[in-house]
């Protein structure tokens, strides 16, 4: 039945964004208000969890902003990236499923830079794995629901 | 039945990446390794077969990257680009679905550049036709398994 | 049935691009030729309505381009930005689901300038509702069909 | 825990110079800049000077630019100060700290090592 | 250069006093504004960052405001552990300076 596939949209949750420049995995999402809503999958421990075996289709939309009312950046050249990365408890190890960004030069000659990343694949998630977001520069996300986001959507069964 | 629909998703073999600064067909990708899977759909001759009519969603992530580490630059100015062409062996002629990819100014001042970009559509594939990608400078592909790649699941039949 | 599920692949019509360089509405896209298509969706007024409630996947990929033989910029720093926004009718009211984009810095030094914005995600739609694209500086889209269109399919039902 | 460890001060003579270094622990020494800050004997704090979490762009205080050197090995995460043309004025506690957010300044120093004394006669 | 003057430079009070201590620049400058406490043979301690925002596992009873040319820092009670020597900081266009510091001694 098609109502019964899972699926997932989670929206960045600012109020607990990490400082430094680091890659770091982001845990605050929203599962239930705006465009966020999740079924047949779980949100728990700032990670996405499969309950059902599947291929899906994942993507993350990642979007860094800096204004200069903001305060002076550290540095102006930026490595602006999002690793999508699973974990499989019964083998804890962390694997990159998908990697995208960009070296940024954000000069103070403009007040405002911006810059989005969009990934997204297909692959086979089986129950109990945790899909979770790394990024670097977090303090720099853009926190609109319509501009940081991930999520996956069961395709298919696993023959 | 849902598992019975045909995808694909293909990683970059970085053992036989051409070099060159021009749009050259990337033909060496793995179907069966790590991420790399494939069902229902054919790997051949560096081109992936659609063996079941139907529409299909279709995406390609391509990373490049340098370090200074591998050299200079012929020039700092790029075009670092992606193209998803579909062939048809009926009528031999090779047309262009999507493209994506920025003109970039990678400068000596920076020791590190990275840049990626994703596409994604949904496409009417018939039964004999193939799917392929070319790139400009393929000799800045980021070889990670994570990093360069592309693939389609099918969506739904042809009325 | 899989093959009654709505979708819509929408090409830019370039023949009626808006001038200027601040956000627009794109009101002018194919939908059924070459690569654009479209079922048991509707394409009017510019917008992409919702005939059917569901899940859908939603897709835009934007392409911006200038070659100095098109004349000078009139500023070198732009926002290249594309907007997905949902409008309901019974409400009316616009909400943006996707944002993506840069800022980016086209000097004179290069003769061409290149840039894509690729977003997705997942969302809810009912009937009646109805999906368009706003982007800024539109003089600057690529008007082939393979870089500048946006698309939608419908994965599931609503429990 | 997070943790800044200083060493490398000294009695030295003036004219000569020094090289004092930070050890990092506890965090991700790499995502965060990295200041020096000093405190004369009966004086308050004065700042020295700071790197940013690359190593990328270095500031000085007017009172130690072209003499005082500031850098970082983040696969080892030490900071560094090297002290050169030393002067009488230079005697203070030297302590390095942490920039609280690794992508702007201006935000503050949230963690502080104990000092290591320089004195210079 | 902007100059960051503290007043007062020496302060008497008791346990449980409200204590004001205050931190003028010699021009308008931003919200940059850190204060930290210091204690003898002790590492610095970063309480308020951004003029007005508690730095974490800060106790409630410090707070920070002020806009423009003058800025302040607050103990609504004072503690025995809170006396000390406190500094303000500003930031402002990759320059970092500090007050002159304003002790908190035992009336």
């Known amino acids: 039945k098609l109502e019964a596939q899972p699926f997932a949209h989670l929206t960045i949750n600012a109020t607990d964004i990490p400082s430094g420049s680091h890659k770091v995995s982001l845990s605050s999402w929203y599962h239930d208000r705006g465009w966020a809503k999740i079924s047949n999958m779980t949100f728990s421990n700032g990670k996405l969890i499969v309950n059902q075996d599947g291929f899906y289709y994942l993507y993350a939309n990642i979007c860094f902003r800096h204004h200069e009312t903001s305060g002076d950046l550290a540095t102006e050249y930026l490595q602006l990236m999002v690793y999508v990365t699973k974990t499989s408890i019964k083998i804890p190890s962390s694997h990159t499923l998908m990697k995208g960004g960009s070296t940024k030069y954000w000069s103070g000659n403009s007040e405002f830079h911006f810059y989005s990343i969009n990934v997204g694949g297909f692959f086979k998630l089986r129950s109990g794995e945790e899909i979770s977001i790394e990024v670097s520069n977090p303090s720099l996300l853009d926190p609109d629901q319509d501009a940081t986001y991930f999520g996956a959507f069961k395709v298919r069964d696993i023959d | 039945k849902l598992e019975a629909q045909p995808f694909a998703h293909l990683t970059i073999n970085a053992t036989d990446i051409p070099s060159g600064s021009h749009k050259v067909s990337l033909s060496s990708w793995y179907h069966d390794r790590g991420w790399a899977k494939i069902s229902n759909m054919t790997f051949s001759n560096g081109k992936l077969i659609v063996n079941q009519d139907g529409f299909y969603y279709l995406y390609a992530n391509i990373c490049f990257r340098h370090h200074e580490t591998s050299g200079d630059l012929a020039t700092e100015y790029l075009q670092l680009m992606v193209y998803v062409t579909k062939t048809s062996i009926k009528i031999p002629s090779s047309h262009t679905l999507m493209k994506g990819g920025s003109t970039k100014y990678w400068s000596g001042n920076s020791e590190f550049h990275f840049y990626s970009i994703n596409v994604g559509g949904f496409f009417k594939l018939r039964s004999g036709e193939e799917i392929s990608i070319e790139v400009s400078n393929p000799s800045l592909l980021d070889p990670d398994q994570d990093a360069t790649y592309f693939g389609a699941f099918k969506v739904r039949d042809i009325d | 049935k899989l093959e009654a599920q709505p979708f819509a692949h929408l090409t830019i019509n370039a023949t009626d691009i808006p001038s200027g360089s601040h956000k627009v509405s794109l009101s002018s896209w194919y939908h059924d030729r070459g690569w654009a298509k479209i079922s048991n969706m509707t394409f009017s007024n510019g917008k992409l309505i919702v005939n059917q409630d569901g899940f859908y996947y939603l897709y835009a990929n934007i392409c911006f381009r200038h070659h100095e033989t098109s004349g000078d910029l009139a500023t070198e720093y732009l926002q290249l930005m594309v907007y997905v926004t949902k409008t309901s009718i019974k409400i009316p009211s616009s909400h943006t689901l996707m944002k993506g984009g840069s800022t980016k810095y086209w000097s004179g030094n290069s003769e061409f300038h290149f840039y894509s914005i690729n977003v997705g995600g997942f969302f809810k739609l009912r009937s009646g509702e109805e999906i368009s694209i706003e982007v800024s500086n539109p003089s600057l889209l690529d008007p082939d069909q393979d870089a500048t269109y946006f698309g939608a399919f419908k994965v599931r039902d609503i429990d | 825990q997070v943790q800044l460890v200083e060493s490398g001060g000294g009695v030295v003579q003036p004219g000569r110079s020094l090289r004092l270094s930070c050890a990092a622990s506890g965090f991700t020494f790499s995502g965060y800049g990295m200041h020096w800050v000093r405190q004369a004997p009966g004086m308050g704090l004065e700042w020295v000077a700071v790197?940013?979490?690359?190593?990328?762009?270095?500031y000085y205080a007017d009172s130690v630019k072209g003499r005082f050197t500031i850098s970082r090995d983040n696969s080892k995460n030490t900071l560094f100060l090297q002290m050169n043309s030393l002067r009488a004025e230079d005697t203070a506690l030297y302590y390095c700290?942490?920039?609280?957010?690794?992508?702007?300044w201006g935000y503050g120093m949230d963690v502080w090592g104990q000092g290591t004394t320089v004195t210079v006669s | 250069d902007i100059q960051m003057t503290q007043s007062p430079s020496t302060l008497s009070a008791s346990v449980g006093d409200r204590v004001t201590i205050t931190c003028r620049a010699s021009?308008?400058?931003s919200s940059w504004l850190a204060w930290y406490q210091l204690k003898p043979g002790k590492a610095p301690k970063l309480l308020i960052y951004k003029a007005s925002s508690l730095e974490s596992g800060v106790p409630s009873r410090f707070g920070g405001s002020g806009s423009g040319t003058e800025f302040t820092l607050t103990i609504s009670s004072l503690q025995p552990d809170d006396f000390a020597t406190y500094y303000c900081q500003h930031y402002n266009s990759y320059s970092w300076t500090f007050g002159q510091g304003t002790k908190v001694e035992i009336k």
């Open positions: 700290a942490k920039c609280l957010s690794g992508t702007y």
């Open positions: 790197i940013s979490y690359d190593g990328i762009n270095k």
């Open positions: 021009q308008s400058i």
